[in-house]
C-alpha cells in the first residue's frame, strides 16, 4: 500500500522496512522480575513450572503483580519509558511485583511480523499467569497488565487466554496500524480483564494513526482529543533537540500515554481528570465537564473501575509535561447582541482571577460560530489552581474568517471610513469548575456598561444575587 | 566475578576487515547486552553499536552503516564485532562493554581493549 | 544525536583539592547520565550511574548531581589514583554519546 503523505510517512516507511535480524530460533518470552528501581539492576528470571526463582528473587503471592508489556521495537533494547514506569509502581506499591514481560526476539522485526507475533506471547503470558495460579494466595484478580502500544494488544490476548478473569488491563496508546476495525478477539476489548482502562494519545483520522482511534476499554481516555499533544509540537521538539526528526514528534506523542500514566502514579496529590463526552469536538466546546452519574473519572493508574456495557469516551486537556493536571472550566457567555460587526468572527480572551492565583490571558477556542441572542459555550483551562474565582476580564477580537471576509472588511471600510464601533453586548458570565463542579455566575461590574469594543476590557464579578446556580448531585469520583 | 575478555591486537591493510572477540564470564552472558565503544589515539570514546546475545538482534550507530556486523556465540558465551572495508581512520582500541536492560543502565564492565592498527 | 560537552578540557590540581567537572547536554537527558574514569592504557571504569548513584566498590568521595541538561561529577578530596581522564556519557537516546573527555593532572 502506498505510503501516506505528511509527518508519519518516515515512520510509515520504519514499518515496511526490511530488517536483518540475526536470530536463528524465536525463544520463547521471559518474565524479569524488577526487584529494584534501578537501571543497573539486572532483575531476576522468572521461569515457567520452576519455583525456586519465585523463592530466590522474593516473589510476593499476596501482593499486585504488574506486568509491563512493552511493544514494537527499533533497537532490540528497552527504551527508557520501561525505566521510569518500573520506578513509579515501585514507588507507589511497594510491595507489588512487578514484571517485565521481554518479548524483544518477537517485536524487533519487521511491524508486520511483531504484529502477527503478539498472540503468541499473549499465549505465553497467559501460561505463566496460569501456572502461577496453582500457587497458594495468588489471584487474578490481583494482576494488572499494562501494555503500551503493541504490548496492549498482547495484554488483550493474554486477558483472553488466560483461565479465570484478570483484574485490569491499562492499555497506552494501544497501536493503531493492523487493529482498526479488527474483530474484538484480535485486538485489546473490555472482555479481556475485568477493569479495561485505555489512554489514547497518537491517533489521526488522516494519514497514519500510530495509536488506534476507536475505543477498545471500559473506559478509553483521550487527552487533548488524543491526537496533539502539548510539548510535542515540531516546534518543541526541534527547539530542545541538536538534531530533531519528525519520529521524535511521533515518538512523543505515543509515548506520552506512558508519561501520563507515570503522573498518575508518582503525582498522586495531582490527579487529572477526564470527562465523559460523546466527541472530541464537544469537549472543546465546554460542553461535556458534568460528573454525575460516573461521568468523570480520575486518568491513569488512579481511575476508578467503571464497567460500563458501552465503551466510555473520555476527554481532558494537559500541560505539556509532568504534573500534566489542568484545571477545566466552562464559560457560558451569553451575547446580547452584536453591533456593526459585518462578517467578522470574534474571538474572545478572559483572564481569571481567583484567591490562590490569576491566570494568564486564555483564548476562547471557537469550534462553531458564535451565536447573537444565544449562550456560546466554551472551555477553558488553566495549569494552576486559581482556588475560588473572584473576578473575570474579558476582551475581544475581530478575527477574520477568510482572505475574502479580510477583503470585505476592508472594502467595506474604505468606502464608510466613519463607520460606527463595532461592539458586543454582555451581562454575564457563568461559570462551571470541572475539578470541583462549582457552577458560579460572574456579572458585569457596571450594569450600565455592558457593551465591549475590540480591544476593550469588560469586568466581571461574582453576581450579587447568590453566585451558586443550582445545586447538583455531589460528583461519584472523590474530586479534591 | 564478571569478566570481559578481548581477543589480541591486530594490523590490517586498507580495505580489509577485522573480526575482534569478547568473552564473557562471571554472569549469564544472555541476560545483559553487550556494546562496542572505539577509542582513536589521543580522542574520546565513540559508540559503535550493541547486540542482544539473548537472540541475536543487534543496533549499529548510522555512522558505521554497513560496515559493522555484530554476532555471538550462546553456546561459549562470546559476542564478536567485524569491521570491514577498513580505513586509516579506523585505528582505535575498540572495547566491548556489558550493560543492562534499559537503554540508562551504564556500561559497568568493560573488556580491556583490542588495538585495531589500519596501514598500508 | 545528543551532544555532550564538557568542561574544562583539562586541569590541574593536587592532593586534597575539591574538584568539579560539568557536563552539558544538547538537550534534556532526564537524568540518564553516567560517568567513567580511564588511566592511560586502560579500559574505562564506570564511577556514577543514572546522575548521581555510586558503582559498588566505587569511594563515597566521588559523588554525582545535576539535572534536565547540565551535571556535575566531583571529587571531595584528590587522592593519587585519581589523577586520570574523566568521561560522561547520556543514556537517554539512541545513539548513547560521550563527553570530548576532561583529563586531571597533578598540579
Known amino acids: 500500500s502506498p505510503t501516506p503523505f505528511g509527518p508519519e510517512g518516515q515512520l510509515a516507511d520504519e514499518l515496511h522496512k526490511p530488517k536483518a535480524i540475526q536470530t536463528e530460533v524465536k525463544p520463547s518470552v521471559r518474565f524479569n522480575l524488577r526487584t529494584s528501581k534501578d537501571p543497573e539492576h539486572e532483575g531476576c528470571y522468572l521461569s515457567l513450572g520452576h519455583s525456586q526463582p519465585l523463592e530466590d528473587c522474593g516473589f510476593n503471592m499476596t501482593a499486585k503483580t504488574f506486568f509491563i508489556i512493552h511493544g514494537w521495537t527499533m533497537s532490540g533494547i528497552f527504551e527508557n519509558w520501561l525505566h521510569k514506569l518500573v520506578s513509579a509502581l515501585h514507588t507507589r506499591e511497594k510491595d507489588a511485583n512487578v514484571v517485565v514481560v521481554d518479548w524483544l526476539p518477537l517485536a524487533h522485526q519487521l511491524y508486520t511480523d511483531a504484529v502477527n507475533n503478539t498472540r503468541v506471547v499473549g499465549h505465553s503470558i497467559a501460561r505463566m499467569l496460569d501456572w502461577l495460579q496453582e500457587k497458594d494466595d495468588f489471584s487474578l484478580g490481583n494482576v494488572h497488565l499494562i501494555g503500551y502500544s503493541l504490548g496492549a494488544h498482547v495484554a488483550g490476548y493474554a486477558g483472553n487466554f488466560v483461565k479465570g478473569t484478570v483484574g485490569r488491563i491499562t492499555g497506552l496508546d494501544p497501536a493503531g496500524p493492523m487493529f482498526e476495525g479488527a474483530d474484538i478477539h484480535k485486538r485489546l476489548s473490555p472482555d479481556d480483564a475485568d477493569f479495561v482502562d485505555v489512554l489514547h494519545t497518537y491517533t489521526r483520522s488522516f494519514g497514519l494513526s500510530i495509536g488506534i482511534q476507536m475505543p477498545v476499554g471500559h473506559i478509553d481516555i483521550y487527552p487533548n482529543g488524543g491526537d496533539f499533544q502539548p510539548g510535542c509540537g515540531l516546534n518543541d521538539v526541534l527547539g530542545s533537540m541538536a538534531y530533531g526528526t519528525i519520529t521524535e514528534v511521533v515518538k512523543c506523542e505515543h509515548e506520552r500515554a506512558v508519561h501520563l500514566f507515570v503522573d498518575s502514579l508518582v503525582n498522586q496529590d495531582k490527579p487529572s481528570f477526564a470527562f465523559q463526552c460523546t466527541d472530541s469536538n464537544r469537549f472543546k466546546k465546554g460542553i461535556c465537564l458534568s460528573c454525575r452519574k460516573n461521568r468523570c473519572n480520575s486518568i491513569g493508574y488512579n481511575a476508578k473501575k467503571m464497567r460500563n456495557k458501552r465503551n466510555s469516551k473520555m476527554y481532558l486537556k494537559t500541560r505539556a509535561g509532568m504534573p500534566f493536571r489542568v484545571y477545566h472550566y466552562q464559560m457560558k457567555i451569553h451575547v446580547f447582541s452584536y453591533k456593526n460587526m459585518g462578517e467578522i468572527e470574534p474571538t474572545f480572551y478572559v483572564t481569571l482571577y481567583g484567591t490562590n492565583a490569576d491566570s494568564q490571558t486564555l483564548p476562547l477556542e471557537i469550534v462553531e460560530r458564535i451565536e447573537q441572542n444565544a449562550t456560546n459555550t466554551f472551555l477553558v483551562y488553566t495549569e494552576e489552581d486559581l482556588g475560588d474565582l473572584l473576578k473575570i476580564q474579558l476582551t475581544w477580537e475581530g478575527a477574520s474568517q477568510s482572505w475574502y471576509n479580510l477583503w470585505k472588511e476592508l472594502r467595506s471600510y474604505l468606502s464608510q471610513p466613519h463607520n460606527p464601533g463595532r461592539e458586543l453586548n454582555i451581562r454575564r458570565i457563568r461559570v462551571k469548575s470541572g475539578e470541583t463542579q462549582r457552577k458560579l455566575t460572574f456579572c458585569a461590574e457596571d450594569p450600565e456598561n455592558t457593551s465591549i469594543s475590540p480591544g476593550r476590557e469588560l469586568w466581571f464579578r461574582k453576581c450579587r444575587d447568590g453566585w451558586r446556580m443550582k445545586n447538583e448531585t455531589s460528583p461519584t469520583v472523590e474530586l479534591p | 566475578q564478571v569478566q570481559l575478555v578481548q581477543s589480541g591486537a591486530e594490523v590490517k591493510k586498507p580495505g580489509a576487515s577485522v573480526k575482534v572477540s569478547c568473552k564473557a564470564s562471571g554472569y549469564t552472558f544472555t541476560d545483559n547486552t553487550i556494546h562496542w565503544v572505539r577509542q582513536a589515539p589521543g580522542q574520546g570514546l565513540e559508540w559503535m553499536g550493541h547486540i542482544n546475545p539473548y537472540y541475536g538482534g543487534t543496533n549499529n550507530n548510522e555512522k558505521f552503516k554497513d560496515r559493522v556486523t555484530m554476532t555471538r556465540d550462546t553456546s561459549i558465551s562470546t559476542a564478536y564485532m567485524e569491521l570491514s572495508r577498513l580505513r586509516s581512520d579506523d585505528t582505535a582500541v575498540y572495547y566491548c562493554?556489558?550493560?543492562?536492560?534499559?537503554?540508562?543502565?551504564?556500561?559497568?564492565?568493560w573488556g580491556q581493549g583490542t588495538t585495531v592498527t589500519v596501514s598500508s | 544525536d545528543i551532544q555532550m560537552t564538557q568542561s574544562p578540557s583539562s586541569l590541574s590540581a593536587s592532593v586534597g583539592d575539591r574538584v568539579t567537572i560539568t557536563c552539558r547536554a544538547s538537550?534534556?537527558?532526564?537524568?540518564?547520565l553516567n560517568w567513567y574514569q580511564q588511566k592511560p592504557g586502560k579500559a574505562p571504569k564506570l564511577l556514577i550511574y543514572?546522575?548521581?548513584k555510586l558503582h559498588s566498590g566505587v569511594p563515597s568521595r566521588f559523588s554525582g548531581s545535576g539535572s534536565g541538561t547540565d551535571f556535575t561529577l566531583t571529587i571531595s578530596s584528590l587522592q593519587p589514583e585519581d589523577f586520570a581522564t574523566y568521561y560522561c556519557q547520556q543514556g537517554n537516546t539512541l545513539p548513547f554519546t560521550f563527553g570530548q573527555g576532561t583529563k586531571l593532572e597533578i598540579k
Open positions: 538537550q534534556d537527558i532526564n537524568n540518564y
Open positions: 562493554a556489558r550493560k543492562g536492560i534499559y537503554y540508562s543502565s551504564p556500561f559497568d564492565y
Open positions: 543514572y546522575t548521581s
